[in-house]
């Protein structure tokens, strides 16, 4: 969480950003809020990126003002227009690219003053893993698959029964480059699994951490998975 204050103006206004991560090929959000104004005509939102000459996005007098927008962001940005009046300056970024990573500044002018705050935006690929029983294998085997990751993650297996056990000797992980030549498919196989146990496949890089759980009993198989972005926490 980064809070910035304006330097000049009738008085400085508080602008707050939250570091976030974008999943390449998907839409992302750069989060920014500010002390609201009561009239739209006086609100100016400018998004800038370090190292980029043109603007990322500008919104003023109730409209997008894109004449100064940098080419790399053309047609890819939008504010939540209906939320500007209540102090939401967040930017929607379409079709996130690896090159969108960097330091962004959310700069706000209202009738009450000015303010700005920076945010770090990381880009990569992350996806939910799915763990299944591999019935084709000769022994009891689990297969953990996640379709899109970048940069290359680490994969660690864990078990509820054998807590703290190291499964690296009985597992095998491979990374297969996807067709767009950036992201990779992650496949990890765990051998010699026992019944009535819960196994977790944990995939992690510097952007996200995802876990796929599977519980295999005589009568049923239960699955659960979740994904957590690592750099969206307050800082």
């Amino acid at each position: 969480l980064i809070i910035g204050f304006g330097i000049s103006g009738r008085h400085s206004i508080t602008v707050t950003t939250v570091a976030s991560a974008g999943n390449i090929g998907e839409d992302g959000i750069l989060s920014c809020t500010f002390e609201p104004d009561i009239k739209l005509s006086d609100i100016v939102i400018q998004w800038l990126k370090e190292g980029v000459i043109g603007l990322v996005h500008e919104f003023k007098e109730g409209k997008d003002e894109l004449s100064e927008q940098d080419e790399m962001f053309r047609g890819r940005t939008a504010v939540f227009a209906d939320q500007v009046i209540v102090g939401n300056a967040s930017l929607r970024l379409k079709n996130v690219q690896l090159t969108d990573a960097g330091t962004y500044k959310c700069y706000i002018i209202t009738s009450k003053g000015k303010g700005n705050a920076n945010l770090e935006y990381k880009t990569g690929a992350f996806s939910m893993p799915e763990v299944n029983v591999d019935y084709n294998a000769s022994s009891e085997t689990l297969r953990c698959e996640a379709p899109r990751w970048f940069p290359q993650p680490t994969v660690v297996w864990a078990s509820q029964v054998d807590q703290g056990a190291n499964f690296s000797e009985v597992s095998n992980t491979s990374f297969e480059l996807n067709s767009e030549n950036v992201t990779m498919k992650v496949v990890s196989v765990l051998y010699n699994v026992t019944i009535n146990n819960t196994y977790s496949c944990m995939i992690e890089n510097d952007i996200a951490k995802a876990t796929g759980d599977i519980k295999v009993t005589e009568s049923e198989i239960k699955r659960r998975s979740h994904l957590q972005l690592l750099n969206s926490k307050a800082s």
Partner: antibody, heavy 117, light 107 residues
Framework: QVQLVQSGAEVKKPGASVKVSCKAS????????MHWVRQAPGQGLEWIAA????????DYNQKFKGKAKITAVTSTSTVYMELSSLRSEDTAVYYC??????????WGQGTMVTVSS | EIVMTQSPATLSLSPGERATLTCKAS??????VAWYQQKPGQAPKLLIS???YRYTGVPDRFSGSGSGTDFTLTISSLEPEDFAVYYC?????????FGGGTKVEIK
């Protein structure tokens, strides 16, 4: 849930003053503007003023400068509007309303102020 | 001051009919217009914000459109509970101003 609870009806003589209150709950009081809007009997809506409790910034309709004064007490999440030099044409229902997610998305129940000799 | 002019002042329609209410701003207000419904003895209720965003819990028979100076509130098929007074309001500039209202009454 968001609630705005206003003080009760008032009957005042011409020239007197009245202070109407609006107690907010269910949201972060200091983060959103609170407005006052009035409606004379059988008439439309008229914006009076607004206050941002986070720093006590105010914005007034020029028409009501000198007539209305708004204040906020953050410890009790209450906004007050004082109307001075009352005249019969100030007889109206006075509403407090806030802008949390959208413009004027929550309203108080209204306070009837009657000015009569 | 931005003047908001609503028309018609009164609209006499039957349940099931379509209602079209208009609001004209005296200058460009972008999309900064909200619509409210008010019934006798009650506070106004937000229906549409930012010209076209239907507020939470508002039935989808209500829709808003327009930008610049011309705005429309449409009720696709009137229900008995829709007979009320409707106000438009601009938040583009201060003083914030409301239209004079359109009363939708049963024919």
């Amino acid at each position: 849930q968001v609630q705005l609870v206003q003080s009760g009806a008032e009957v005042k003589k011409p020239g007197a003053s009245v202070k109407v209150s609006c107690k907010a709950s269910g949201y972060t009081f200091t983060s959103y503007w609170m407005h006052w809007v009035r409606q004379a009997p059988g008439q439309g809506l008229e914006w009076i003023a607004a206050i941002y409790p986070g720093n006590s910034d105010t914005d007034y309709n020029q028409k009501f400068k000198g007539k209305a004064k708004i204040t906020a007490v953050t410890s009790t999440s209450t906004v007050y509007m004082e109307l001075s030099s009352l005249r019969s044409e100030d007889t109206a229902v006075y509403y407090c309303t806030t802008t949390v997610a959208h413009y004027f998305d929550y309203w108080g129940q209204g306070t009837m102020v009657t000015v009569s000799s | 001051e931005i003047v908001m002019t609503q028309s018609p002042a009164t609209l006499s329609l039957s349940p099931g009919e379509r209602a079209t209410l208009t609001c004209k701003a005296s200058q460009d207000v972008s999309f900064a217009v909200a619509w409210y419904q008010q019934k006798p003895g009650q506070a106004p209720k937000l229906l549409i914000s930012s010209a076209s965003y239907r507020y939470t819990g508002v039935p989808d028979r209500f829709s808003g459109s327009g930008s610049g100076t011309d705005f429309t509130l449409t009720i696709s098929s009137l229900e008995p509970e829709d007979f009320a007074v409707y106000y438009c309001q601009q938040h583009y500039n201060t003083p914030l101003t409301f239209g004079g209202g359109t009363k939708v009454e049963i024919k």
